[in-house]
């Protein structure tokens, strides 16, 4: 759930890495209220996820490794 470019709350679903093409990080500041990882899916959706959750960290780690290899 997002308002303009800000995530307002986190998804309550778990996504598979095969569904995700990339991510961006949202930092809490004067524009956005919460820290979030925004996953970009193969369907063109942006999904707001909690950066503290293990499943989110795993995908971020996996995607970061891929990027570093390139």
């Amino acid at each position: 759930a997002s308002n303009f470019d800000c995530c307002l709350r986190y998804t309550d679903r778990i996504l598979h890495p095969k569904f995700i093409v990339g991510f961006t990080q949202q930092l809490a500041n004067e524009t956005c209220d919460i820290n979030a990882v925004v996953f970009h899916t193969k369907k063109g959706l942006s999904v707001c996820a909690n950066p503290k959750q293990t499943w989110v960290k795993l995908i971020v780690r996996r995607l970061s490794k891929k990027i570093n290899k390139m």
């Epitope: 679903r13 778990i14 996504l15 598979h16 095969k18 569904f19 193969k42 503290k52 959750q53 293990t54 499943w55 795993l58």
Partner: antibody, heavy 120, light 107 residues
Framework: QVQLVQSGAEVKKPGASVKVSCKAS????????MHWVRQAPGQGLEWMGV????????TYAQKFQGRVTMTVDTSTSTVYMELSSLRSEDTAVYYC?????????????WGQGTLVTVSS | DIQMTQSPSSLSASVGDRVTITCGAS??????LNWYQRKPGKAPKLLIY???NLADGVPSRFSGSGSGRDYTLTISSLQPEDFATYYC?????????FGQGTKLEIK
């Protein structure tokens, strides 16, 4: 070796609650999710939800939202599934299953199952 | 939620037969699909993960294929111990829905 040992069979009255336990051994408990899946008589497998023992994050199937609670006790490597407001349709065998993101998020080890009978 | 549809729902075959079970998803699940075997009175057993990968200890007569919305489980030469019910499962996104099952019976 990996083992998931569940609590024994339960008989409950409609409206009551049941709490099923699943004790894990043979692996690092907090490194794997734990799913709960049930099978009612003559029916197929039904995914109920999952808990991540490392942070207690849970997500439940919509059908069970508000009736199911999954909890974890890391000191004993045990996961619990409590289902409330039981009805006759909840009569089923309930399984815990280890979720392994290393093998494509599959459920690679299963408990022996716990039969829950709901009857007045 | 993603719906999974298996066919056939039941199947009669003989020892030595080649058997194919299909599973269709209501949308593209990008290969995030697992197959399980369940025998009466026993817990399900993982057979195939990631649509095509054989789980540890599973005989090589089992194989999985498919992509997008359509997936297949094949048993190349049926053995007596293979008579059971088989389920596919979506793991692309929770809820992790199962197919309704395919019961494989002795002809």
């Amino acid at each position: 070796q990996v083992q998931l040992v569940q609590s024994g069979a339960e008989v409950k009255k409609p409206g009551a609650s049941v709490k099923v336990s699943c004790k894990a051994s043979g692996y690092t408990f907090t490194n794997y999710w734990m799913h709960w899946v049930r099978q009612a008589p003559g029916q197929g497998l039904e995914w109920m939800g999952v808990i991540d023992p490392s942070d207690s994050y849970t997500t439940y199937a919509q059908k069970f939202q508000g009736r199911v609670t999954m909890t974890v006790d890391t000191s004993t490597s045990t996961v619990y599934m409590e289902l409330s407001s039981l009805r006759s349709e909840d009569t089923a065998v309930y399984y815990c299953a280890r979720g392994n993101y290393g093998v494509d998020y599959a459920m690679d080890y299963w408990g022996q199952g716990t039969l829950v009978t709901v009857s007045s | 939620d993603i719906q999974m549809t298996q066919s056939p729902s039941s199947l009669s075959a003989s020892v030595g037969d080649r058997v194919t079970i299909t599973c269709g998803a209501s949308e593209n699940i990008y290969g995030a699909l697992n197959w399980y075997q369940r025998k009466p009175g026993k817990a399900p057993k993982l057979l195939i993960y990631g649509a095509t990968n054989l789980a540890d200890g599973v005989p090589s007569r089992f194989s999985g294929s498919g992509s997008g919305r359509d997936y297949t489980l094949t048993i190349s030469s049926l053995q007596p111990e293979d008579f059971a019910t088989y389920y596919c499962q979506n793991v692309l996104i929770t809820p992790y829905t199962f197919g309704q099952g395919t019961k494989l019976e002795i002809k």
